[in-house]
């Protein structure tokens, strides 16, 4: 079954190579369990950025090598992700998954354009 | 009368603050003399931010304490805006006018949304 | 394209540590972490843990928390699995793994270490 | 954790056989399935992700459907090269799990 997901139109990472967004999803009933998966789409090539599991009021447990971090309130996601460079701009898509009770409920949201830029390194303190 | 402007939708500056991007106008004569202004509109205020004139074939020439440079190549214009910094995030609204020979023509883009990170400062070399 | 290479076989007394190696090649190796997966003769596959290899952040198996330590060094693009006070449960097969586009599917893998612990 | 059962935990087969294997989720995880396959002496090689998407490079005969709980392998028509052991693995949530594995024997 189908949901609606909102995420921002556009964010920029720090100096540092962090950026962080909202992931809103309308939930259609009372879900214990949500799985949230940062999608990047760039040159029509979509990868999995990271995901997490977690149960309504608990901290997020994220999958594998992850470089997001995050923390839910209601039906909101605050998600970071860390470490980008440059070349990591592109388009990152929030999809959300109600896992628990059934029924089943999945949605996609419009994506987030994220702007990295590197920084110049600093002079070497001699 | 109208003419048709067309600029990159969205450029990001570098970690120094430079902004470059191309402003191309659809020539309905041949122009000797132009006029290259640069908008920034920004919280539905507009501010001109650099303007210069230009004989075909010759260098561009910004009015007084200018914070652009920018060259000539045909009917495209390669502008740079220098020392961004985030505050100065906006869209950069590129504006022509063919002002000799007659009769006058003016364009103006749909903007160039440029996005500025302030970067880190470097750590102090003791 | 993406190469893992592990380190040669090893025999340990019971008590004893390992230290694994997974050499990377082919791809930007702070770009993905990698996990750790193992196999004791003639069983299944279980999951050690993963690290991130652009930070060192790393998340362990329950059952290993403690014993286990995983790291990289982002000069020569090299993973490294410890695992501490060994026993013979844990004489296995050891595979370091990296994902591709999807989180926790794995086609890329080392070609395995043996670990033999003797006691 | 997720606990991944698999069954038949062995099989006998010959050439040209339609083989199905299943894989059972202790909870839903969705289309998080993954199949492997490992030959003796071997690293496991990924033959199926997300439950049905096809890894580059492995041959059409293997296939996978299901979601939810309930996952199955299929071998078309098997092949000298398909005696092996296969393995299932949730990438649902972490700690990531393996089924016990079905190895393929000759009939």
């Known amino acids: 079954k189908a949901m609606h997901v909102a995420q921002p139109a556009v964010v920029l990472a720090n100096s540092r190579g962090i950026a962080s967004f909202v992931c809103e999803y309308a939930s259609p009933g009372k879900a214990t369990e949500v799985r949230v998966t940062v999608l990047r789409q760039a040159d029509s090539q979509v990868t999995e950025v990271c995901a997490a599991t977690y149960m309504m009021g608990n901290e997020l447990t994220f999958l594998d090598d992850s470089i997001c971090t995050g923390t839910s309130s209601g039906n909101q996601v605050n998600l970071t992700i860390q470490g980008l460079r440059a070349m990591d701009t592109g388009l990152y898509i929030c999809k959300v998954e109600l896992m628990y009770p059934p029924p089943y409920y999945m949605g996609i949201g419009n994506g987030t354009q994220i702007y990295v830029i590197d920084p110049e390194p600093c002079p070497d303190s001699d | 009368k109208a003419m048709h402007v067309a600029q990159p939708a969205v450029v990001l500056a570098n970690s120094r603050g430079i902004a470059s991007f191309v402003c191309e106008y659809a020539s309905p004569g041949k122009a000797t003399e132009v006029r290259v202004t640069v908008l920034r509109q920004a919280d539905s205020q507009v501010t001109e931010v650099c303007a210069a004139t230009y004989m075909m074939g010759n260098e561009l020439t910004f009015l007084d304490d200018s914070i652009c440079t920018g060259t000539s190549s045909g009917n495209q214009v390669n502008l740079t805006i220098q020392g961004l910094r985030a505050m100065d995030t906006g869209l950069y609204i590129c504006k022509v006018e063919l002002m000799y020979p007659p009769p006058y023509y003016m364009g103006i883009g749909n903007g160039t949304q440029i996005y500025v990170i302030d970067p880190e400062p470097c750590p102090d070399s003791d | 394209q993406v190469q893992l290479v592990q380190s040669g076989a090893e025999v340990k007394m019971s008590g004893a540590s390992v230290r694994v190696s997974c050499k990377a090649s082919g791809y930007t190796f702070t770009s993905y972490g990698i996990s750790w997966m193992r196999q004791a003769p003639g069983q299944g596959l279980e999951w050690m843990g993963w690290i991130t290899a652009y930070n060192g952040n790393s998340n362990y198996a329950q059952k290993l928390q403690g014993r286990v330590t995983m790291t990289t060094d982002t000069s020569t693009g090299t993973a490294y699995m410890e695992l501490r006070s060994l026993t013979s449960d844990d004489t296995a097969v050891y595979y370091c793994?990296?994902?591709?586009?999807?989180?926790?599917?794995?086609?890329?893998w080392g070609q395995g270490t043996l670990v033999t612990v003797s006691s | 954790d997720i606990q991944m059962t698999q069954s038949p935990s062995s099989l006998s087969a010959s050439v040209g056989d339609r083989v199905t294997i299943t894989c059972r989720a202790s909870q839903s995880i969705s289309s998080y399935l993954n199949w492997y396959q490992q030959k003796p002496g071997k690293a496991p090689n990924l033959l199926i992700y997300t439950a049905s998407s096809l890894q580059s490079g492995v041959p059409s005969r293997f296939s996978g459907s299901g979601s939810g709980t309930d996952f199955t392998l299929t071998i078309s028509s098997l092949q000298p090269e398909d005696f092996a052991t296969y393995y299932c693995?949730?990438?649902?949530?972490?700690?990531?799990?393996f089924g016990g594995g079905t190895k393929v024997e000759i009939k």
């Open positions: 693995q949730q990438s649902y949530s972490s700690p990531l799990t």
């Open positions: 793994a990296r994902r591709g586009d999807y989180l926790g599917v794995f086609p890329y």
